[in-house]
């Protein structure tokens, strides 16, 4: 139930990468406005994003209080220049998200590899520690500060001139592997956390070679 | 229920070729890797290859290479195996074996294997 | 590649004895191996993984230790259901490899 001219929103979706989290809905408000509340399962509500023609809200400022938390947000639709309105039941129309935990949820971003070092048949690996926007004492936390040993990454590594890609994974940011002496080796890096059953993996990280910047060679 | 389910086994001669599927339920492949391991007549386990569904990422035994190609339909959810150039010693009960990528890395759930004969 | 030397490959036990199986990489795997249970006819089962932690729903008389690039896969007590053949492998690098298979009979 509503008003006459409100429509309640839909297709509430949370977006979420590396803990930065968006809610979205539809539809795209025709005379009408939105106002967006969240909650922890035990908290009160906070509203966000007040009275907005936007059909996202950036909630991030809220879930980094506590990742481990579950989440619930309901988006209130309200009659454009008319926001005290009420529906016939004596409140706002009003549709709940799907819950959401976004330590269990948020997809890992794409990570980068940092840099790479050669000595001699060794090359040590490193991929960088992305910053996100989880906060401890005043300081952003790294992704691997916020998840700890329970984030994994693979590496992908193969000789330029072979197409078969071999396999290395750490619970560190570094690598160190083997390598044929005089061969040049490409790289790539995937995020995983294995005790996930969903969003379990980053995208490929972009393909570095060796030759390329990033690298350095040592006898 | 996580399951694997190998099928396209059978009989086939030296010099063929045959395509083994994997279809996997209960999980979504593409957030895995699919390794195949064979195991001829009386013998212990040997690995074959491994696909990483999410970029293609391929690796095969050398005993293998050049020969089969293994590849993952992730809107089906099924991972493949062709064998081609086929020799009396490929003859062996094929599986299909799910790898939750964690740091060790086990084969966690395997399926029940499907018999190939290379014989004429 | 990384070799998985077991031994040994046949062993005969009797119901509640205790039996040890062994696995040696040839070059350093860290904690990257996994045990498997085979029976005929059947595709192998986790036992272990990083090398001493129990799979769920494995019973507890099965266990696995580390020392060095040698790996050990005890059963405490042995029961009528775990005869069958006992696999190590590793899956530190490209290609994982498996050892050669102990096979568990009946004495």
């Known amino acids: 139930s509503g008003t006459t001219n409100t429509v309640a929103a839909y297709n509430l979706t949370w977006k979420s990468t590396n803990f930065k989290t968006i809610l979205e809905w539809e539809p795209k408000p025709v005379n009408q406005v939105y106002t967006v509340q969240i909650s922890t399962k035990s908290g009160d509500w906070k509203s966000k994003c007040f009275y907005t023609t936007d059909t996202e809200c950036d909630l991030t400022d809220e879930i980094v209080k506590d990742v481990k938390q579950t989440y619930l947000a309901r988006v209130f639709s309200y009659p454009a220049g008319n926001v005290e309105s009420t529906g016939s039941a004596g409140e706002p129309l009003y549709e709940n998200s799907p819950e959401f935990t976004p330590y269990l949820e948020t997809n890992l971003g794409q990570p980068t590899i940092q840099s790479f070092e050669q000595v001699g048949t060794k090359v040590n690996v490193t991929v960088e520690d992305e910053r996100t926007l989880v906060r401890r004492n005043n300081t952003f936390l790294s992704l691997r500060d916020v998840f700890g040993k329970d984030l994994i990454y693979t590496l992908y590594y193969w000789k330029s001139s072979s197409s078969g890609k071999k396999t290395a994974k750490t619970n560190t940011n570094e690598f160190l592997i083997d390598v044929d002496k005089g061969e040049n080796y490409c790289f790539s890096v995937q995020a995983v956390i294995p005790s996930r059953t969903v969003n379990r993996k980053s995208t490929d990280s972009p393909v570095e070679c060796m030759g390329q910047e990033k690298g350095e060679f040592r006898e | 229920e996580v399951q694997l389910v190998e099928s396209g086994g059978g009989l086939v001669q030296p010099g063929g070729s045959l395509r083994l599927s994997c279809a996997a339920s209960g999980f979504t492949i593409a957030y895995y890797i699919i390794h195949w391991v064979r195991q001829a007549p009386g013998k212990g386990l040997e690995w074959v290859g491994y696909?990483?569904?999410?970029?293609?990422?391929?690796y095969y035994a050398d005993s293998v290479k050049g020969r089969f190609t293994i590849s993952a339909d992730t809107s089906k959810n099924t991972a493949y195996l062709q064998m081609n150039s086929l020799r009396a010693e490929d003859t062996a009960v094929y599986y299909c074996?799910?790898?939750?990528?964690?740091?060790?890395?086990?084969?966690?759930?395997w399926g029940q294997g499907t018999l190939v004969t290379v014989s004429s | 590649d990384i070799q998985m030397t077991q031994s040994p490959s046949s062993l005969s036990a009797s119901v509640g004895d205790r039996v040890t199986i062994t696995c040696r990489a040839s070059?350093?795997?860290?904690?990257?191996v996994a045990w498997y249970q085979q029976k005929p006819g059947k595709a192998p089962k986790l036992l272990i993984y990083?090398?001493?932690f129990l799979y769920s729903g494995v019973p507890s008389r099965f266990s696995g230790s580390r020392s060095g690039t040698d790996f050990t896969l005890t059963i405490s007590s042995l029961q009528p259901e775990d005869f069958a053949t006992y696999y190590c492998?590793?899956?530190?690098?490209?290609?994982?490899?498996f050892g050669q298979g102990t096979k568990v009979e009946i004495k």
């Open positions: 492998q590793q899956h530190y690098t490209t290609p994982p490899t």
């Open positions: 074996a799910r790898d939750d990528q964690s740091l060790s890395s086990p084969f966690d759930y």
């Open positions: 070059q350093d795997v860290n904690t990257a």
């Open positions: 696909i990483d569904p999410s970029n293609g990422y391929t």
């Open positions: 990083s090398a001493s």
